[in-house]
Interface confidence: medium
Amino acid sequence: SERCDDWGLDTMRQIQVFEDEPARIKCPLFEHFLKFNYSTAHSAGLTLIWYWTRQDRDLEEPINFRLPENRISKEKDVLWFRPTLLNDTGNYTCMLRNTTYCSKVAFPLEVVQKDSCFNSPMKLPVHKLYIEYGIQRITCPNVDGYFPSSVKPTITWYMGCYKIQNFNNVIPEGMNLSFLIALISNNGNYTCVVTYPENGRTFHLTRTLTVKVVGSPKNAVPPVIHSPNDHVVYEKEPGEELLIPCTVYFSFLMDSRNEVWWTIDGKKPDDITIDVTINESISHSRTEDETRTQILSIKKVTSEDLKRSYVCHARSAKGEVAKAAKVKQKVPAPRYTVELACGFGAT
């Protein structure tokens, strides 16, 4: 058949939906691959065709739009399931074509099961709340377009397995859940169950997200260098190994890039001829403050190396800091017998 621009399997858009719930899936062509929208395509005489490949099969087959109660239907650029079944899992393809043009993309759809406490293999979005920051809200995600604005759904919120009612600092307000003052104890999975009627049937939408309480911008400080510091002197003899850790604390800052680097005599270690290695490790606190450690290592230090300046630098959105390590050569202990002998004129 004629050539078709095939965008392949778009694994970036791994779509997961719950079993026995409505799902509306937009054709990704118009969102991510083409420069025009569905309306433009439709008015230009292009047709959108859907087909699928079942899980563990190679055969592409058309989607059956003649199921009882219109269980699967298409509306403009949206594929509807009312509701999904477990065996709807597979790779779905939407193809836009006319006699002279063709473009298609496939994407994986996984129908997942949940238990009575909403546990499932679903990848959960993470919503970050600032600790002790005043009122903050989360909104029940991905429910737009399922019912018209004239329909008033009922929304029930859960934390883990428990319905949220009479909680100290968490208040359900329809599609929103308000945290009066977020604390570490508010970390967890929150689920909204949206129930709405349609054509004499009742449908449920379940949406779970993870709330992570993080450091507040009110408490954020520029990077703090714990080591090197004024309390520690790196006193070495030539031939010994020199190990200097640079340990830096970074306050949590949304979308901030935290950087730590060493300079030796004002240059990056890569730009000098010393045989130096640097190993980095990163750890996080409960509020996602970060501690980065970079260990500078010179296996066999020379007396020249011990005269150099070793400076640890750190940078975040809050500022840049630097601290020099105190490095010096060990003074050998005097050899008293020889010196005393010389003093007495011995030869």
Epitope: H231, V232, V233, E235
Partner: antibody, heavy 123, light 112 residues
């Protein structure tokens, strides 16, 4: 996970010396101060001193200056405390304890402890 | 050197009671934003265990019935509802400045 495993009980005579060990695992040994704390039978906790393994920098409580020596072997992630000129009042359980890191320079808490080594000094 | 004085030296409580231990430093162990005061629990024959660091920061894994407060020279450890496993000795500890750390003399929490 972080673990500090200390050497076994010791019995020494007055005037002798003893060297206790503390093997660390589960974290980057050289980047945390290691402290030694002792506890005489039925008494409270008493800080002996601390060492920064990366550099060998040490600090001692005045009482132990000159009598306690803290060292480390970074290749085996082991800290040592040697106590010389032992006397009967040195009979105690000796703990090694790691300091945590905090956002501010200055005081650190002792977040992980070894199981303790009982030193008995008796003639 | 900074001295720490804990009170009371022993405390009797029943399961479910609220227990409060105080620790007074001979000079301030606080600066803007934090205090170098920590609390430990020790059971007979065991190593101390960190409960609260920097006056009020609950150590990971420690039950939320433990809380700490205070700044400057006066600090408090509170157990909101004493449980059977809480009967132990509690120590305050300051780490203000290098190189001297000191501990309070301890408070023994006993069953009433």
């Amino acid at each position: 996970q972080v673990q500090l495993v200390q050497s076994g009980a010791e019995v020494k005579k007055p005037g002798a010396s003893v060297k206790l060990s503390c093997k660390a695992s589960g974290y980057i040994f050289i980047t945390y101060w290691m402290n030694w704390v002792r506890q005489a039978p039925g008494q409270g906790l008493e800080w002996v001193g601390q060492i920064f393994p990366a550099s060998g920098t040490t600090y001692y409580a005045q009482k132990f200056q000159g009598r306690a020596t803290l060292t480390v072997d970074t290749s085996t992630s082991t800290a040592y405390m040697e106590l010389s000129s032992l006397r009967s009042e040195d009979t105690a359980v000796y703990y090694c304890a790691r300091t945590d890191f905090y956002r501010y320079d200055g005081g650190y808490a002792l977040d992980y402890w070894g199981q303790g080594t009982l030193l008995t000094v008796s003639s | 050197d900074i001295q720490l004085t804990q009170s009371p030296s022993s405390l009797s409580a029943s399961v479910g009671d609220r227990a409060t231990i105080t620790c007074r430093a001979s000079q301030s162990v606080s600066t803007s934003g934090y205090s170098s005061m920590h609390w430990y629990q020790q059971k007979p024959g065991k190593a101390p265990k960190l409960l609260i660091k920097y006056a009020s920061d609950l150590e990971s894994g420690v039950p939320s019935r433990f809380s700490g407060s205070g700044s400057g020279t006066d600090f408090t450890l509170t157990i909101s509802s004493v449980q059977p496993e809480d009967f132990a000795t509690y120590y305050c500890h300051h780490s203000w400045g290098i190189p001297m750390y000191t501990f309070g003399q301890g408070t023994k929490l006993e069953i009433k």
